[in-house]
């Protein structure tokens, strides 16, 4: 099985971490995301999740994370404001596609937050200052409760183009292409 | 592996129409959005227009030359995109490619051969 | 429309030596920190074949002489060493917004 890759963000406490998933294809433009965190000898849990469907550009917040699901470009920001280091671990998006399992998005992120504020970011940091202000028309949205018997499945690598280097624009027309990830809240 | 092959090219007289013909095999082909992109002799590249998927409503998008006189549709259950050309204009000769890209608003990581269009009197 | 605009319009490299060509936008290309702007390679007779994509991205199976650089508005793709199997006409593209648009395209020579 191919390893599975991983994105480091190293930020202090306080700021803001600012990803974005992205999924490609239209198909799965209108299908709810989700943002998870993976302990170790855990399934992944969902912390938060777009509205069912997926609406374009819509902030959902769900306590200091905030999910925008950009339609037109493919792409899920999601953002983790006022870093504390207990939010340290490893994240990844999920597409739900129910009644099949969820697509795991590449690449997973490994956040890492320290202590102590770094005062003024580096423009490549993606962070922000302790007060963030919340955008006004934010939405929480009910995450679905997913279970499945199965384990993290993988696939061997494609060897045709669909799967560009280095930022693996993942074609997922097929069921053997994706990370199969059995989701528990 | 991925293949575009175009066809229903050839010589149209100035306010004449042809519709060109793009069959795709190798791929899902419902799953992507399928493009045109046509080259003058000697020319740059210019994008023609380009057709989404079901999901999208096959929402079609074109360039100011062509808005009004060209249609991108396609057939999934044929795996075919098409390009009808009406009211044809002599600086609409050039080779008319059809292009694949890798999602939304993603590179153009796959091409067709090209077919001619030649409009001339 | 978004206006791309290439430079030079040609260009003569010994072999060897380094290629650089600049793609300048008449507007931002750049969806959050993602740059939708790619560069394609077109020999004569032939379709175009992707070289870069969202600006700095080696499109598998080109070789790693090509890179891409930059954001927002200004962009190059560098050939570190040519070739001579690198003499060909080179486009950038962009795809951020639609109508999508390419430029008009460099001439690469060798010297």
């Known amino acids: 099985a191919t390893k599975l890759t991983e994105e480091k963000y190293e930020l202090k406490e306080g700021q803001t971490l600012d990803v974005k998933c992205d999924y490609t294809l239209e198909k799965f433009a209108s299908s709810q995301k989700a943002w998870q965190i993976i302990r170790d000898g855990e399934m992944p849990k969902t912390l938060a999740c777009t509205e069912r469907p997926s609406k374009n550009s819509h902030p959902v917040q769900v306590g200091r994370i905030i999910l925008e699901d950009y339609h037109d470009h493919g792409l899920l920001r999601v953002r983790m404001v006022n870093l504390q280091v207990e939010d340290s671990g490893l994240y990844q998006c999920v597409i739900y596609q129910p009644p099949k399992e969820p697509h795991m998005l590449f690449d997973r992120i490994r956040l890492v937050v320290t202590k102590g504020f770094s005062g003024t970011p580096g423009s490549n940091e993606n962070s922000t200052q302790n007060v963030y202000k919340i955008p006004p028309t934010t939405t929480k949205a009910l995450c679905p409760l997913y279970t499945s018997p199965r384990t993290v499945t993988q696939a061997p690598p494609k060897s045709t183009a669909d799967v560009s280097t280095p930022d693996s624009e993942i074609n997922l027309t097929n069921v053997t292409d994706i990370i199969r990830v059995p989701v528990f809240n | 592996e991925v293949q575009l092959v175009e066809s229903g090219g050839g010589l149209v007289q100035p306010g004449g129409s042809l519709k060109l013909s793009c069959a795709a095999s190798?791929?899902?082909?419902?799953?992507?959005?399928m493009h045109w992109v046509r080259q003058a002799s000697g020319k740059g590249l210019e994008w023609v227009g380009r057709i989404r998927t079901k999901s999208s409503n096959y929402a079609t998008y074109y360039a100011a030359s062509v808005k009004g006189r060209f249609t991108i549709s396609r057939d999934d259950s044929k795996n075919t995109a098409y390009l009808q050309m009406n009211s044809l204009k002599t600086e609409d000769t050039a080779v008319y490619y059809c292009t694949r890209d890798m999602g939304i608003r993603r590179q153009f990581a796959y091409w067709g051969q090209g077919t001619l269009v030649t409009v001339s009197s | 429309d978004i206006v791309l605009t290439q430079s030079p319009d040609s260009l003569a490299v010994s072999l060897g030596e380094r290629a650089t060509i600049n793609c300048r936008a008449s507007?931002?290309?750049?969806?959050?920190?993602?740059?939708?702007l790619h560069w394609y390679q077109q020999k004569p007779g032939q379709p175009p074949k992707l070289l870069i994509y969202?600006?700095?991205n080696l499109e598998s199976g080109v070789p790693d002489r090509f890179s891409g650089s930059g954001s927002g508005t200004d962009f190059t793709l560098t050939i570190s060493s040519l070739q001579a199997e690198d003499v060909a006409v080179y486009y950038c593209?962009?795809?951020?917004?639609?109508?999508?648009?390419f430029g008009q395209g460099t001439k690469l020579e060798i010297k």
């Open positions: 507007q931002s290309v750049d969806t959050f920190d993602y740059s939708f």
């Open positions: 593209q962009q795809s951020n917004e639609d109508p999508y648009t």
């Open positions: 969202r600006a700095s």
């Open positions: 190798g791929f899902t082909f419902s799953t992507y959005a």
